[in-house]
């Protein structure tokens, strides 16, 4: 019981993770204008991995597509890639675990198959929430840097006469959007890896019990339970009889009037 | 079309107060924010501030902070600048105007002259 | 504040001939978002309210006549009448649209010679 709860918990916060990180990927605030300490404009600036936006006092906004690919920073290139490969992961690792769960079941695949399939959406989610960490981690790096280089030739000017203001730029909302579904991803990810360890239980070696019932005699053999290395069923791990005795999570395990495909 | 029409002129002594409307027709008076703008006689043009009719939210030009106010009643569409203790320098003519994009100035109200004289 | 400097204060000029109005801002209107320049002009004749002409410093409005028009880009702008008609004889003021407050030029008078 505890395996499926952690297994179905993991997948949901895995889920929210993978949302969030499509949500930051496209939100327009990645950068947004700094406020504190500038003169007060009527035109407040964003921008975001795919375009820029101008928001005035009227309620006008105005955006406007990076329609360039070469003319872009690096740095800029490098967290977009970070952001899609998270996401790309992260939609396999989802598709992966839906035929993981355990409260699914999809034709006779064994736990052991379905341990399997948790590790690998796990470890999928593990590395698409540091996809996104890392991309946006990348991200507020460049706008620090930037920051300063701004702050330190905020006014440029012609004999100190005229005044140009350099806009500069802070930490927009998606930032903390990804830091914060980057983080539900990697926590997802840990769950389900957490989780394939209880679907796949360890070699349990029981001594040989006689059960004498009514005249004849039926014997538990050892190795019964190994745990299966492969998605395909294993023919070699099964009991030789089905008695009346079954663990927990062979319980679960047989379809019952409260099971739902 | 977009009207601005504001309430006629206004004769007032000093100290006292005065309410100066503007009513907006032929467009969703919510959207767009209100400006207002002060001319004292032979003089030049004077942003006062304006209030965004969305949110209630005002901004104030520094020199018209204290003794003037911005209101609005959504339900009629109207705009309000409101001023107290009246001084003789308060004598101009008071202008709205819808804020529209390019933050540009785009509809006008026509005027209300207001006199402070003892 | 930010100052709005308009020269000539007045300007006087033949009909048909070309007038030129200039703005000067102490900080730079142009935004580096949209690179758009945040200067509007306006027009204002006796006893009117002012009229809207040219906003994003070069952008007419419409049904204004095209013998208006603006140019320059960050902190000096210019108004031109390239025709000056008898309709034209106005107070001219140029406006800061980017800082609060929105600050306005001045003005400059435009008369007939």
């Known amino acids: 019981m505890a395996v499926t709860a952690c297994q179905g918990l993991g997948f949901v916060v895995s889920l929210i993770g993978i949302a969030g990180i499509i949500a930051a990927t496209c939100m327009d605030q990645w950068s947004t204008q700094d406020l504190y300490n500038n003169p007060v404009t009527a035109v407040f600036n964003y921008q975001g991995l795919w375009r820029s936006c101008v928001r005035e006092s009227s309620g006008f906004t105005e955006c406007r597509g990076y329609f360039t690919l070469l003319g872009l920073p690096a740095m800029l290139q490098a967290v977009r890639a970070l952001m899609i490969v998270g996401i790309v992961l992260g939609a396999i690792g989802l598709l992966v675990s839906i035929f993981a769960l355990k409260c699914i079941r999809i034709g006779s695949m064994e736990d052991s198959a379905k341990a399997n399939m948790t590790l690998t959406s796990g470890i999928m989610f593990i590395v698409s929430g540091l996809c996104a960490i890392a991309g946006v981690s990348v991200f507020a790096n460049m706008l620090v840097t930037n920051f300063w280089m701004s702050t330190a030739n905020m006014y440029t000017g012609m004999g100190g006469m005229v005044q140009t203001v350099q806009t500069r730029y802070t930490f927009g909302a998606a930032l903390f959007v990804g830091w914060v579904a980057g983080g539900l991803t990697l926590i997802g990810g840990v769950m389900m890896c957490i989780a394939c360890r209880g679907l796949a239980p360890e070699e349990t070696n029981y001594k040989a019990v006689s059960y004498h019932a009514s005249g004849h005699s039926v014997a538990y053999k050892p190795g019964g339970f190994k745990a299966s290395t492969g998605f395909g069923s294993n023919t070699k791990n099964k009991k030789i009889y089905d008695g009346g005795a079954r663990t927990e999570d062979e319980v679960q395990s047989y379809p019952s009037k409260h099971d739902y495909v | 079309q977009v009207q601005l029409v504001q309430s006629g002129s206004e004769l007032k002594k000093p100290g006292a107060s005065v309410k100066v409307s503007c009513k907006a027709s032929g467009y969703t008076f919510t959207n767009y924010g209100i400006n207002w703008v002060r001319q004292a006689p032979g003089q030049g043009l004077e942003w006062m501030g304006w209030?965004?009719?969305?949110?209630?939210?005002?901004t104030y030009a520094e020199e018209f902070k204290g003794r003037f106010v911005f209101s609005l009643d959504t339900s009629v569409s109207t705009a309000y600048l409101q001023i107290s203790s009246l001084k003789a320098e308060d004598t101009a003519v008071y202008f709205c105007?819808?804020?529209?994009?390019?933050?540009?100035?785009?509809?006008w109200g026509q005027g209300t002259l207001v006199t402070v004289s003892s | 504040d930010i100052v709005m400097t308009q020269s000539p204060d007045s300007l006087a000029v033949s009909l048909g001939e070309r007038a030129t109005i200039n703005c000067k801002s102490s900080q730079s209107l142009l935004n580096s978002g949209n690179q758009r320049n945040y200067l509007t002009w306006y027009q204002q004749k006796p006893g009117q309210p002012p009229k809207l002409l040219i906003y994003w410093a070069s952008t007419r409005e419409s049904g204004v006549p095209d013998r208006f028009s603006g140019s320059g880009s960050g902190t000096d702008f210019t108004l031109t009448i390239s025709s000056l008609q008898a309709e034209d004889v106005a107070v001219y003021y140029c406006q800061n649209a980017y800082y609060y407050p929105l600050t306005f030029g001045g003005g400059t008078k435009v008369e007939i010679k």
């Open positions: 105007a819808r804020l529209y994009y390019g933050n540009r100035f785009d509809s």
């Open positions: 209030i965004n009719p969305n949110t209630g939210e005002t």
